[in-house]
């Protein structure tokens, strides 16, 4: 790693990219980008995938956390020759696809989508991916979009979740490498440290969750705190306060010494869940304390 | 427990229109997440889907290139069901047609019970 | 779009294990699904998502999928799991099965 920011949240990133005729003498450019980011997530909990468009939409790694298969991946993405057109509601259906897949039975997963392209889509190609990404919005993802050249950022604002998703490269594909950073800062969720830590058993407590990107969510009214217990019982609380860097929730009243609390973040009412590995244990407190 | 009740004729003339129907119960033909599809199975073919209809705040439908022409799936809310329609049709579309539920429109992950259509004068 | 191939017949002897392929250009890239049909009735999932069981199928179906094959595999195969046997995939707008393979438990 060179020291540069990181990433430390526990979801699922999808990156959809275009790889149509016109990014051909691009490639590299696109691929650097991808790999660069790809380094910044570095969650054991967060799972990755690379999915290409043209014509048709390809899944090129399906969600793994397994860094070697990463490693694999990013070489196959690597060897992509582009051509074709820009179909992307392809890419965006089989993200969608994924996401059915992986959130089917019990434990959701939240999902992050970022999207490259690099041209305008003509009519029906928009219609087809502002339904294609909503679909994938209506699973659970939260989707940006990076417009290089000359894409159309009033398009690219209605397939992200909003204007303030969408990255604009106006300077071509070497200019990639620039929003690296703003694209980490905004794209991250991420749990890092609950205060107080340990709490008293039987007693109630509210928590402060440190972390950042808790105000990326498109609706701050749908943040949940989440805490799973003795890893069964999941409680859902609503936060009295919701910043960029913390959240103040209820503590769910724990009954006895010694059992814990696995933090979650849900940006979406609790339809999926950003993991951690940030625990709150109980402890005896007496009288006194 | 969601079920798939298919109805229509098991008879159709060449040249005529082939329909079908399907009955949804414990499920809503508007559901947000599902797709409602239609496959026919025959000995020549095998399974072959043919198209499917969905609901994000409208309706859409998608159809296999083999029958875009002559295909038309309508969604009928007022009675949780849903229709095919397929035109001008041929001995080669003799088959058990089925209708099914396709959650998160991917698979079909409930099958009506099938109905053998004979497509002969 | 993808072409999916599979063996018209497979046989296995009651409480062996059976495996089922399904070979496709590239597969891997794509999610496979299996349906059980028994005849006259009309197909059930199976697997779906390369390896995922729908609640109330039993544990002894499993699948996976990697290279150019998807593979059904039965553990411990029962008398009840002889049927046909149909791997598809959804790609691009469409939904393609392959031809079907049927499993004979013998004895």
């Known amino acids: 790693e060179d020291g540069g920011p990181a990433c430390y949240g526990g979801f699922d990133l999808y990156f959809i990219l275009d790889k149509s005729g016109s990014v051909l003498h691009h490639w590299n450019e696109i691929y650097y980008f991808v790999e660069q980011l790809a380094h910044r997530f570095i969650s054991p909990q967060l799972r990755m995938s690379f999915i290409v468009f043209s014509t048709r939409g390809t899944t090129l790694m399906k969600l793994t956390e397994d860094r070697e298969q990463i490693r694999q991946g990013l070489e196959e993405l690597q060897k992509v020759l582009p051509g074709g057109d820009t179909y992307m509601h392809e890419g965006f259906e089989r993200a969608s696809e994924q996401i059915y897949y992986e959130n089917s039975q019990g434990y959701r997963t939240a999902s992050v989508i970022i999207a490259l392209t690099d041209g305008e889509l003509h009519e029906d190609l928009f219609f087809y991916s502002e339904r294609e990404a909503n679909r994938s919005r209506d699973l659970g993802a939260i989707v940006y979009c990076v417009g290089v050249k000359d894409f159309n950022e009033t398009q690219l604002a209605r397939i992200a979740d909003s204007k303030d998703h969408v990255f604009p490269v106006n300077d071509g594909f070497q200019a990639l490498q620039g929003i690296i950073h703003s694209i980490l800062k905004k794209s991250c969720i991420e749990i890092l440290a609950a205060e107080p830590s340990t709490i008293c058993a039987g007693e109630s407590f509210q928590v402060v969750v440190r972390g950042n990107g808790f105000r990326h969510a498109r609706n701050v009214d749908r943040v949940l705190c989440s805490f799973k217990i003795n890893d069964s019982v999941t409680l859902n609380e609503k936060p009295f306060a919701v910043e960029d860097t913390y959240l103040l929730c209820p503590a769910p009243i724990l009954k006895e010494v010694g059992m814990k609390a696995a933090l979650q973040v849900s940006m979406n009412d609790g339809l999926s869940f950003i993991s951690s590995s940030v625990i709150i244990t109980t402890t005896h407190c007496s009288d006194g304390s | 427990q969601v079920q798939l009740q298919q109805s229509g004729p098991g008879l159709v003339k060449p040249s005529q229109t082939l329909s079908l129907t399907c009955a949804i119960s414990g499920d809503s033909v508007s559901t947000n997440g599902a797709a409602w599809g239609w496959i026919r199975q025959s000995p020549g073919r095998g399974l072959e889907w043919l198209g499917r209809?969905?609901?994000?705040?409208?309706?859409?439908?998608d159809y296999a290139v083999s029958v875009k022409s002559r295909i038309t799936i309508n969604p009928d809310t007022s009675k949780n069901q849903f229709s095919l329609q397929l035109n001008s049709v041929t001995p080669e579309d003799t088959a058990v047609y089925y209708c099914?539920?396709?959650?998160?429109?991917?698979?079909?992950?409930?099958w009506g019970q099938g109905t053998l259509v004979t497509v002969s004068s | 779009d993808i072409e999916l191939t599979q063996p018209p017949s497979v046989s296995v002897a009651p409480g062996q294990t059976a495996r089922i392929s399904c070979s496709g250009d590239n597969i891997r890239s794509y999610y496979a699904h299996w349906y059980q049909q028994k005849p006259g009735q009309a197909p059930v999932l199976v697997i779906y998502g390369d390896s995922k069981r729908p609640s109330g199928i039993p544990e002894r179906f499993s699948g996976s999928n990697s290279g150019n094959t998807a593979t059904l595999t039965i553990s411990g195969t029962q008398a009840e799991d002889e049927a046909d046997y149909y791997c598809?995939?959804?790609?691009?707008?469409?939904?393609?099965f392959g031809g079907g393979t049927k499993l004979t438990v013998l004895g």
């Open positions: 099914a539920r396709m959650p998160g429109g991917f698979l079909f992950d409930l």
């Open positions: 209809i969905y609901y994000r705040s409208k309706w859409y439908n």
């Open positions: 598809s995939s959804y790609a691009s707008h469409d939904y393609v």
